[in-house]
């Protein structure tokens, strides 16, 4: 049994610097509690963004201070990540464990190419 | 650097219980999922139990089921293996891991504790 | 519960040399999520290779993992004498998370 998890290859984000993609899973079995962690790869290092576990049917709550918020429907997760710069560029990779019941199932998607483009200064208006 | 050092090991009588403690520093706890997986003397290396993130989570191995619990205190850093009812084949060195960013693969090991379950 | 098989038990090759080590899962391992551990007497195992073929930190070039699906395959292209030890391969798409049962590798 194989999960899969797959997210779309290239997202632009918007001038207030938030950007949305989709991390759908296949399930290889009836999970209820479902954790869904989202890693930035850029030059070789790995860093966690944010993650949230959340029960099926129920919302995602991901911590107060966290860049990142998500809705889930079935197996599918619609993830947002704000206060983005272009700095932040980079592989964004949806990670998806099934947490209960046993047995335990992970899988990790390829990856979101996330580009972010810092918005030019207004001009001074006289 | 990562750092996981266990301790609580010893000689123990079949059916007695034990509790072994790791204490990790290093990384952030509670990012990550912590395992225990022991290797009896000259045999190979069996995955025990691990208890995720938050520590609401546990997995065991068919082996320890319903006899050892595992746990975690993230505010101390520490993770427990509380082994009851023991046997003389629980004997083994038993190391705490921690799981990988990737996966349950295991990064980071501990020296390793040594469990005798002997009359 | 996925099953790994190690092959050969025992591998005795020389200083130099190339060694192949191969490990079988009874089941497709989900993702090529498989991971070679080396392990040398009275120390705790060290991760190799994650990801069937991803080297861990400071791992040297010399060890490289291969496979997919249920066949998979470390390599050490020379042989160093640190490299005399035993090697398991472990699976972690799925638990209960299952080692297999080693291909100790010694001088010849």
């Known amino acids: 049994k194989a999960m899969h998890v797959a997210q779309p290859a290239v997202v632009l984000a918007n001038s207030r610097g938030t950007a949305s993609f989709v991390c759908e899973y296949a399930s290889p079995g009836k999970a209820t509690e479902v954790r869904v962690t989202v890693l930035r790869q850029a030059d070789s290092q790995v860093t966690e963004v944010c993650a949230a576990t959340y029960m099926m049917g129920n919302e995602l709550t991901f911590l107060d201070d966290s860049i990142c918020t998500g809705t889930s429907s079935g197996n599918q997760v619609n993830l947002t990540i704000q206060g983005l710069r272009a700095m932040d560029t980079g592989l964004y990779i949806c990670k998806v464990e099934l947490m209960y019941p046993p047995p335990y199932y992970m899988g990790i998607g390829n990856g979101t190419q996330i580009y972010v483009i810092d918005p030019e200064p207004c001009p001074d208006s006289d | 650097q990562v750092q996981l050092v266990e301790s609580g090991g010893g000689v123990v009588q079949p059916g007695r219980s034990l509790r072994l403690s790791c204490i990790a520093s290093?990384?952030?706890?509670?990012?990550?999922?912590m395992h225990w997986v022991r290797q009896a003397p000259g045999k190979g290396l069996e995955w025990v139990a691990v208890?995720?993130?938050?520590?609401?989570?546990?997995h065991y191995a068919d082996s320890v089921k319903g006899r050892f619990t595992i746990s975690r205190d993230n505010s101390k850093n520490t993770l427990y293996l509380q082994m009851n009812s023991l046997r003389a084949e629980d004997t083994a060195v038993y190391y705490c891991?921690?799981?990988?960013?990737?996966?349950?693969?295991?990064?980071?090991w501990g020296q390793g504790t040594l469990v005798t379950v002997s009359s | 519960e996925i099953v790994l098989t190690q092959s050969p038990g025992t591998l005795s090759l020389s200083p130099g040399e190339r060694a192949t080590l191969s490990c079988r899962a009874s089941?497709?391992?989900?993702?090529?999520?498989l991971a070679w551990y080396q392990q040398k007497p009275g120390q705790a195992p060290r991760l190799l290779i994650y990801?069937?073929?991803s080297r861990a930190t400071g791992i040297p070039d010399r060890f490289s993992g291969s496979g997919s699906g249920t066949d998979f395959t470390l390599t050490i292209s020379r042989l160093e004498p640190e490299d005399f030890a035993v090697y398991y391969c472990q699976q972690y798409g799925s638990s209960p998370f299952t080692f297999g049962p080693g291909t100790k590798v010694d001088i010849k």
């Open positions: 089941q497709s391992v989900s993702s090529s999520y």
């Open positions: 208890n995720w993130y938050d520590g609401s989570n546990k």
């Open positions: 891991a921690r799981g990988g960013v990737w996966g349950p693969y295991f990064d980071y």
């Open positions: 290093g990384f952030t706890f509670s990012s990550y999922g």
């Open positions: 990801g069937a073929s």
